[in-house]
């Protein structure tokens, strides 16, 4: 077996020049000819110097998995997927994200303690006594108002989700 140089690849008992990123081998070199390289067609790529007969298939980012394309596929690099807005990564695969999930929605009676990021879900916290949050989107719970003195009866005690007026 030949031990080829860094910029060559083995073909039988000979060495041929590699094709550059974005190209694949259309025809191996001969005695009088160099390697014939052909550009990758749309939807395919090769990221390194190579002796490949076909370009590789670009991956596609599946919105159903909460993914969006963070780097488009080019002939020299595969696509990269990130999380769609409002989603965080649930399957981190090295420097790729394989699947994302929508942020949790805080319930009424809770506040958003920490907003979601690409790697972490929204963190919700129950409102402390005497405060309320009617829709769960607030960063701070609101203080309930006391009933006016001319009302004969109080409509009911306040809850962390709703206030009585």
């Amino acid at each position: 077996l030949p031990s080829c140089k860094e910029d060559e690849y083995p073909v039988g008992s000979e060495c041929c020049p590699k094709c550059g990123p974005g190209f694949h081998v259309r025809q191996a070199c001969g005695e009088q000819t160099g390697t014939v390289c052909e550009p990758c067609s749309p939807g395919t790529y090769i990221a390194h110097f190579n002796g490949l007969s076909k370009c590789l298939q670009c991956q596609m980012c599946d919105p159903a998995m909460g993914l969006r394309t963070s780097r488009n596929c080019s002939t020299t690099a595969n696509a990269l997927c990130g999380c769609s807005p409002g989603h965080f990564c649930i399957i981190q695969d090295g420097d790729h994200c394989a699947a994302c999930r929508a942020y949790a929605t805080s319930s009424p009676g809770q506040r958003v303690q920490k907003g979601g990021t690409e790697s972490q879900d929204t963190l919700c916290q129950n409102c402390p006594p005497g405060t309320f949050s009617s829709n769960g989107t607030l960063e701070e719970c609101q203080h309930g108002t006391k009933c006016s003195k001319w009302l004969v009866t109080e409509a009911g005690p306040g809850t962390s989700s709703f206030r009585w007026v």
Epitope: L1, E6, P10
Partner: antibody, heavy 119, light 106 residues
Framework: QIQLVQSGPELKKPGETVKISCKAS????????MNWVKQAPGKGLKWMGW????????TYADAFKGRFAFSLETSASTAYLQINNLKNEDTATYFC????????????WGQGTSVTVSS | QIVLTQSPAILSASPGEKVTMTCSAS?????MHWYQRKSGTSPKRWIY???KLASGVPARFSGSGSGTSYSLTISSMEAEDAATYYC?????????FGAGTKLELK
């Protein structure tokens, strides 16, 4: 979660045909290339080739040109490996494996399908 | 084709011991990938692009190398690391695997 589930073991006679299935779930089959790998008893892993699941175009390693065929049924999220005119040396476990990343490593593998060829 | 030679073929290590296995390519390759396989199961991605750990792989594993010489190292052997490890290249066709290094617990 992402899974590649292969069809069950096969016992065949020389000259017959076998068709192995690989059903993808948890992702869209056509979003990633699919590879096929052979492991004969007591031997190492041997790459058979791959199929571009978007275009349907197969690529075969030299040792697997002729009697071997990769195909797809995208509506069923399934890739297939068919081996025609079976020979004793085709006795092996066959794996499907998804190509992933910038330099294509195999991130998910099927559980393997054992094919035994014996008269 | 590029032949990948893994050494040693069999390696025995005690818990806590540092382990190194190598993968030598017959011609220069751009990247090396590694898989772990336990008996009766399919291979698992383990290290990709020479040195990046796949999801769920313990930090005691590392990969390095360039050109024709690559290695996988475990800083401190644990019982669950006993398995066969395969290297793989696809710088040129055909894609090839090494014959594997079987790592046993001493």
């Amino acid at each position: 979660q992402i899974q590649l589930v292969q069809s069950g073991p096969e016992l065949k006679k020389p000259g017959e045909t076998v068709k192995i299935s690989c059903k993808a779930s948890g992702y869209i089959l056509t979003n990633y290339g699919m590879n096929w790998v052979k492991q004969a008893p007591g031997k190492g892993l041997k790459w058979m080739g791959w199929i571009n699941t978007y275009t349907g175009e197969p690529t075969y390693a030299d040792a697997f040109k002729g009697r071997f065929a990769f195909s797809l049924e995208t509506s069923a999220s399934t890739a297939y490996l068919q081996i025609n005119n079976l020979k004793n040396e085709d006795t092996a476990t066959y794996f499907c494996a998804r190509g992933y990343g910038n330099h294509w490593y195999f991130d998910y593998w099927g559980q393997g399908t054992s094919v035994t060829v014996s008269s | 084709q590029i032949v990948l030679t893994q050494s040693p073929a069999i390696l025995s290590a005690s818990p806590g011991e540092k382990v190194t296995m190598t993968c030598s390519a017959s011609s220069s390759v751009s990247y090396m990938h590694w898989y772990q396989r336990k008996s009766g199961t399919s291979p698992k991605r383990w290290i990709y692009d020479t040195s990046k750990l796949a999801s769920g792989v313990p930090a005691r594993f590392s990969g390095s190398g360039s050109g024709t010489s690559y290695s996988l190292t475990i800083s401190s052997m644990e019982a669950e690391d006993a398995a066969t490890y395969y290297c793989q290249q696809w710088t040129s066709d055909p894609l090839t695997f090494g014959a594997g290094t079987k790592l046993e617990l001493k």
